[in-house]
């Protein structure tokens, strides 16, 4: 288990960080510097770090079930379940569901009435007692109702010229009835003697186009449950068809653009709105099967076989029988239908919030186990043969208050889950002593919950009217930082900084903004290690004897003297016993200056002044001309040539000294002064 | 100016305990760090052990569980208590303390542990 937590100052906080978390309550249990966040960890981090095993909370998921005892027949148990959640962990009970003998069945029996149904129309007129006699068999309480359809009553459905909307059949002396899309027939009776009156009226009718519109039908039977009479029961639509089915978009073809709205609509018995609905899809039929507990039989003909078999992978709890060509079939059809349809479970649950998952292990009778799928399925269920389901309910955050409920498709027992949040930590109520917070707060789980007025780890700050963001202002940079750097806390308005996981690593600064270890490194080491330097804010500040930007270098100058043991000439400075040159002076000992400009423009007027007492500088020189030394013996250096301020040539030298704009100069007796014309 | 005075140094017998103080006089500044260095004859100066203004604190190994760094921000003034002595902690040990803008380093103060 591991415990990734994120600013996290409350017990509450911690265990929704994740089933790893855990929180130590003991007192004192923070050192200075450390945050709250530290009590959250996981339990062998907090054991490790001195927390006392029942100072640890730790809340888990779980399940408490209740049966209910009243009522009739029960299929599935427990019938009610309360779940406590924390989040990301799993609470997990067991569903057991007992397949009864003889449970009560109604069976609408929804008939294609194109007019290649004709022979198998004949057959069904004559099919009531048979019906009611195989349902009897199989329960004590079977009831039987019946519907038809054709298609939508516009092109290219069926045809619209006046005389084929009257008869559409082929044969015209054939009697036949206008097309329609639903007509509900029979409400579920268990008077077989009415099927037989009710079926015998019926007349053949007829379309255009191949499919026909059977969801609309369908989606009409599902939809209208009071029409139809349907009971609390196993609900079972057979449909019998030999073609295939128009679905959502096919209205297109009619100009029929507004979506079903999965409403029941019939008005006489009649889908009158028809053509202002398109067909249903089949994920939307299936839904409403699913809603309603119906399950479909399609009994279709043989080439229409594979077609339906693609629509029962969609459709939950929903089988296929093979129809013979006039439906001679269909009683023994049913049979075999009903005993598969009722020897497969599936265990689902309704519509849920993104925040809770369910998953389901199903644990089925003939030894086959399924794990961890999105519902719960097991076939070959055999009557009084208990099977066992363990449902799994995970919540990803701290949830409201909320129920779900579980059913077994296709029947109508249900199973009511109650889901709470597990999120409060029921710490010790160590002490209603407030001393421990300064007498201005109380404590909750080991730590101090202010009161107004009062913050810090002990509540020993007095706000003083300063609200808040005040004080937190203060612990920020600027408008654009976190406080403290995200670092520390803020404790009357001045960062306490958290101490450090890292070896070696304190974090401090104004604003928790500096560490120990982020600097340059030498030697594998920051600054050099701990003899050499120390990581201030992100640059090394060395020890006496070191410097360098990772106090790489022992603290001496000897590479840097020139041979009067002035350092660097005077001209630079010596870093790492290497000079560091002012622009333009060379390596290695900055003494010369290739590229500087001639000095001898400069300091005419001070060796005018310094041999002659003459010029601009005459009462002033040694103020004008601090860096000039005169010599009375010729000098090594740059030789020059200016003119004065009387226009006169003077030679003289300049020799550089150790040091910037310092200079001997040796200056020629004579001046070369030319006569101007008479 | 501001200067760092420590005292609390002495000859000790090995297993003994000593607390060392440093103060700052002068201006009242904010020190972000604080720690005690050693330099033992002919060796380099060494970390002992450093504080945050938070009270976070390192310490170098050899003196883990024995010596024990802490502050009084109010006073400005930088303790030491070491415990269990060893002949090895012999040298003399200095107080350094940093602002945002000066490195400051005290005179040192001898510590001898004798065995």
């Known amino acids: 288990q591991e415990c990734t937590k994120f600013k996290v100052s409350s017990c509450r906080e911690c265990i929704e960080s994740g089933p790893g978390c855990t929180w130590c309550q003991k007192l004192n249990f923070t050192g200075p510097g450390d945050p709250d966040s530290i009590r959250c960890d996981t339990r062998p981090q907090l054991l490790m770090r001195g927390c006392a095993a029942d100072d640890i909370m730790d809340p888990t998921s779980l399940a408490e079930t209740q049966e209910d005892h009243n009522g009739g027949q029960k299929q599935l148990s427990p019938q009610k379940v309360t779940l406590y959640l924390r989040p990301g962990q799993a609470a997990a009970f067991n569903v057991t569901f007992r397949r009864a003998k003889g449970y009560p069945i109604d069976l609408y029996y929804l008939m294609d009435l194109s007019y290649s149904m004709l022979d198998d129309l004949r057959n069904v007129k004559k099919l009531g007692g048979d019906l009611l006699r195989a349902l009897n068999e199989i329960t004590e309480s079977g009831r039987i109702g019946f519907g038809s359809f054709v298609d939508k009553t516009v092109l290219p459905f069926v045809n619209t010229h006046p005389d084929k909307l009257r008869n559409p059949c082929p044969n015209k002396e054939k009697e036949c009835q206008p097309p329609f899309a639903f007509r509900h027939v029979l409400k579920l009776t268990n008077n077989s003697n009415q099927f037989q009156t009710e079926v015998g009226k019926q007349l053949i009718s007829g379309n255009l186009d191949a499919p026909e519109g059977g969801l609309d039908a369908m989606m009409q039977v599902a939809a209208c449950p009071e029409e139809i009479g349907w009971r609390n029961v196993t609900r079972l639509l057979v449909f019998a068809t030999d073609d295939g089915f128009h679905f959502a978009g096919d209205g297109k073809l009619g100009a029929i653009l507004t979506p079903n709205d999965g409403r029941c609509h019939l008005e006489d018995n009649l889908y009158k709105r028809s053509n202002e609905f398109d067909y249903p899809s089949v994920g939307q039929l299936a839904h409403k099967l699913a809603e309603n507990n119906i399950q479909p039989i399609f009994a279709v003909t043989s080439r229409m076989v594979k077609t339906y078999e693609k629509l029962t992978e969609i459709i939950p709890k929903s089988a296929v029988g093979e129809l013979s060509e006039d439906s001679s079939n269909v009683v023994h059809l049913i049979k075999n239908a009903y005993n598969k349809l009722s020897s497969r479970v599936f265990l689902d649950h309704n519509a849920l919030p993104d925040t809770l998952k369910v998953t389901y292990d199903s644990f089925c009778s003939n030894g086959v186990t399924h794990r961890n799928q999105p519902r719960g399925d097991c076939d070959g269920v055999q009557i009084n043969v208990p099977i066992t389901f363990q449902v799994k309910v995970t919540a990803t955050e701290c949830i409201q208050e909320q129920s779900f409920v579980i059913r077994a498709l296709g029947f109508t027992d249900i199973v009511t889950v109650q889901v709470l949040p597990q999120c409060e930590c029921r710490c010790r109520d160590q002490s209603r002593d407030r001393s421990l917070c300064h007498g201005k707060g109380f404590l909750e789980c080991g730590i101090c919950r202010c009161d107004t007025g009062y913050i810090g780890k002990n509540c020993e700050c007095q706000t003083q009217g300063r609200s808040s963001q005040e004080l937190e202002g203060s612990c920020r940079k600027d408008n654009n930082s976190i406080i403290c750097s995200g670092l520390g806390d803020c404790v009357c308005g001045q960062c306490l900084c958290h101490t450090s996981d890292v070896p070696g690593k304190l974090i401090y600064g104004q604003y928790c903004e500096c560490d120990t270890i982020n600097c340059e490194r030498y030697n594998g080491q920051v600054c050099g290690g701990p003899g050499r330097g120390l990581c201030f804010c992100g640059k090394c500040r060395c020890h006496p004897g070191f410097e360098g930007s990772a106090c790489q270098c022992e603290r001496t100058t000897e590479g840097c003297l020139n041979p009067r043991r002035v350092e660097c000439s005077g001209r630079g400075r010596c870093r790492c016993n290497v000079c560091e040159c002012h622009s333009g002076y060379q390596l290695p000992l900055c003494q010369e200056c290739p590229g500087c400009p001639s000095p001898c423009g400069k300091y005419i007027s001070c060796a005018e002044c310094l041999k002659f007492e003459k010029g601009p500088f005459g009462k002033n020189c040694s103020a004008a001309c601090p860096g000039l030394q005169l010599s009375n013996n010729p000098v090594k250096g740059r030789t020059c040539k200016e003119r004065d301020s009387e226009g006169c040539w003077v030679a003289y030298t300049l020799e550089q000294q150790d040091g910037m704009d310092r200079y001997l100069i040796y200056v020629d007796e004579s001046r070369e002064c030319v006569a101007g014309p008479n | 100016e501001v200067q760092l005075v420590e005292s609390g140094g002495g000859l000790v017998q090995a297993g003994g305990s000593l607390r060392l103080s440093c103060a700052a006089s002068?201006?009242?500044?904010?020190?972000?760090?604080m720690g005690w260095y050693r330099q033992a004859p002919g060796k380099p100066r060494d970390l002992v052990a450093l504080?945050?203004?938070?009270?976070?604190?390192n310490y170098a190994d050899s003196v883990k569980g024995r010596f024990t760094i802490s502050r009084d921000n109010a006073k400005n003034t930088l303790y030491l208590q070491m415990n269990s002595l060893k002949p090895e902690d012999t040298g003399v040990y200095y107080c350094?303390?940093?602002?945002?803008?000066?490195?400051?380093w005290g005179q040192g103060t001898q510590v001898t542990v004798s065995s």
């Open positions: 504080i945050t203004s938070s009270g976070s604190a």
């Open positions: 350094n303390a940093h602002t945002y803008t000066d490195n400051l």
């Open positions: 002068g201006s009242r500044l904010r020190f972000e760090l």
